[in-house]
């Protein structure tokens, strides 16, 4: 978590002199409670906005906006503490609006906003606005919190941000997967404009289940410059397991900007449609069925063969 660097942070507006300060997230009013404290924020809204740094990089930011309640407690409002908590890492970043003049009665409702917290693609946050001074230990809370989920890099607006581009968001492999026969799968995709290797991860599933019945990994060496943006095709050999017919193909690139953490793209081939008329049940049922293989997973001694070509 960090603040966008691109200009001096301002919170002043007509009728209010205000300065933005870094905060330890532990306001002095926690330690030295006051007798009279303001009421809580109203209508807290968090939206995804985008902002450029001085260097011209584009980042997603949390746009935080709230209003004041129309009560006399605005006379005791000395500022606000804005806190962004990343839920998974428990990392917190705070800033403080410090009012340098007293708020006066106003024809319109007082409204505040702040758009300088940089957020990460796909991450989850809790945003809190505390009015200051904070209440005495048994006082009514004077803060409001909202959760905020940042879309991942597949989202159209996110795709062009600097963090997403660094993880390969502009590469569209346009994957096509075709079942050639019960034992072969053909995968076609478009190479990116970088001499880097790729990995194809194949995971197969039974028709209605989410637990894999076959897994295979295939390495594609780095293409030469003349092969950039060209289609590459690979034929993967499947394990002939009855009912193991739904195949998910995932392509993992290893671009220099993101290494092992690049965005992966996937495509799925569904099982063939079942015929509408059920097969007739035989007059007798066999006592056992022949075994169709001892292991569900591909091991080192039993690799699926595959070959690949780059097309110009």
């Amino acid at each position: 978590l960090r603040l966008l660097d691109h200009r001096a942070l301002v919170c002043s507006q007509p009728g209010l002199n205000c300065t933005v300060k870094n905060s330890t997230c532990l306001d002095d009013s926690w330690i030295h409670p006051r007798n009279l404290t303001p009421s809580s924020p109203k209508d807290l809204q968090i939206q995804l906005h985008f902002a450029h740094t001085q260097q011209g990089d584009l980042f997603p930011v949390a746009h935080i906006e709230w209003t004041l309640q129309t009560d006399a407690s605005i006379l005791y409002l000395e500022g606000a503490e804005l806190s962004v908590l990343q839920l998974n890492t428990n990392e917190r970043l705070c800033v403080k609006f410090q009012f340098l003049s007293m708020l006066q009665h106003h024809r319109k409702r007082w409204r505040f906003s702040f758009s300088h917290f940089v957020v990460d693609p796909g991450q989850e946050y809790e945003v809190t606005v505390h009015h200051l001074p904070k209440p005495i230990p048994d006082g009514d809370p004077n803060h409001q919190s909202k959760n905020f989920l940042v879309p991942d890099c597949e989202h159209a607006r996110m795709k062009v941000t600097t963090p997403c581009m660094s993880s390969g968001s502009l590469w569209d492999p346009n994957i096509t997967v075709e079942t050639l026969d019960t034992q072969h799968l053909r995968v076609d995709f478009t190479l990116w404009n970088e001499s880097t290797h790729y990995q194809i991860l194949l995971t197969s599933f039974p028709h209605m289940e989410n637990h894999s019945c076959f897994e295979h990994m295939h390495h594609i060496p780095a293409p030469r410059p003349e092969e950039f943006h060209q289609r590459s095709n690979v034929t993967l050999t499947l394990r002939n397991l009855k009912g193991c017919c739904r195949h998910q193909v995932q392509i993992q690139p290893f671009f220099s900007s993101c290494l092992n953490d690049c965005l992966r793209h996937s495509a799925t081939v569904s099982c063939p449609e079942m015929p509408d008329t059920p097969e007739p049940i035989p007059d007798y049922m066999p006592l056992w069925e022949p075994r169709s293989g001892s292991s569900d997973y591909k091991d080192d001694d039993d690799k699926g063969s595959s070959h690949h070509h780059h097309h110009h």
């Epitope: 939206q47 839920l87 998974n88 890492t89 428990n90 989850e124 909202k146 959760n147 989920l149």
Partner: antibody, heavy 116, light 107 residues
């Protein structure tokens, strides 16, 4: 391929405890939180809480506070949910799911039956 | 806590037709809404989050419209695999809460 695989069905007596496991694969457990949601037979979904494997931080629904404990073991990429003082109305399918707000991958569910 | 109300409880639609499912929040949740699909004996599957962003691999026939308190999930042309129960969920504030579900069945 992200997968969350849960432990098998359990039958428990009222007053007992149950501990359900959820093994994550296809991603790093510490990259996302794990949430727990339950579903009573023929009913809707009920959020129980979440744990961050990265920080160990937890948030529990008030209803389960003091009765539930969520933990993780990063060495085995496994999350656990323990529910104590079981009652008959705790009979449900218990799901683990990845993330803390919009839950993008779910385990297959573990049926916990509480019956005397 | 925020109460999520879904309607109708059951929706009968023919394959190829449009299905419209409604979800109402007891207070404004901005766009902090997710939709899930659940088939019998299976776990829920995330369809949409942020009230309009489709999750990975979800076809374009699923879309959401709304913000604040009123949301609508639209399935533009129902396929055989779309007959299931659909739940909405708010993640605006704790605790996370789900709607009671809408069952979409074949007419």
């Amino acid at each position: 391929q992200v997968q969350l695989v849960q432990s098998g069905a359990e039958v428990k007596k009222p007053g007992a405890s149950v501990k359900v496991s959820c093994k994550a694969s296809g991603y790093t457990l510490t990259s996302y939180g794990i949430s727990w949601v339950r579903q009573a037979p023929g009913q809707g979904l009920e959020w129980m809480g979440w744990i961050s494997a990265y920080s160990g931080n937890t948030k529990y629904a008030q209803k389960f506070q003091g009765r539930v404990t969520m933990t993780t073991d990063t060495s085995t990429s496994t999350a656990y949910m323990e529910l104590r003082s079981l009652r008959s109305d705790d009979t449900a399918v218990y799901y683990c799911a990845r993330r803390q707000l919009a839950l993008d991958y779910w385990g297959q569910g573990t049926l916990v039956t509480v019956s005397s | 806590e925020i109460v999520m109300t879904q309607s109708p409880a059951t929706l009968s639609v023919s394959p190829g037709e449009r299905a419209t499912l409604s979800c109402r929040a007891s207070q404004s949740i901005s766009s902090n809404l997710a939709w899930y699909q659940q088939k019998p004996g299976q776990a829920p599957r995330l369809l949409i989050y942020g009230a309009s962003t489709r999750a990975t691999g979800i076809p374009a026939r699923f879309s959401d419209n709304g913000s604040g308190t009123e949301f609508t999930l639209t399935i533009s042309s129902l396929q055989s695999e779309d007959f299931a129960v659909y739940f909405c969920q708010q993640y605006d504030t704790w605790p996370l809460t789900f709607g009671g579900g809408t069952k979409v069945e074949i007419k």
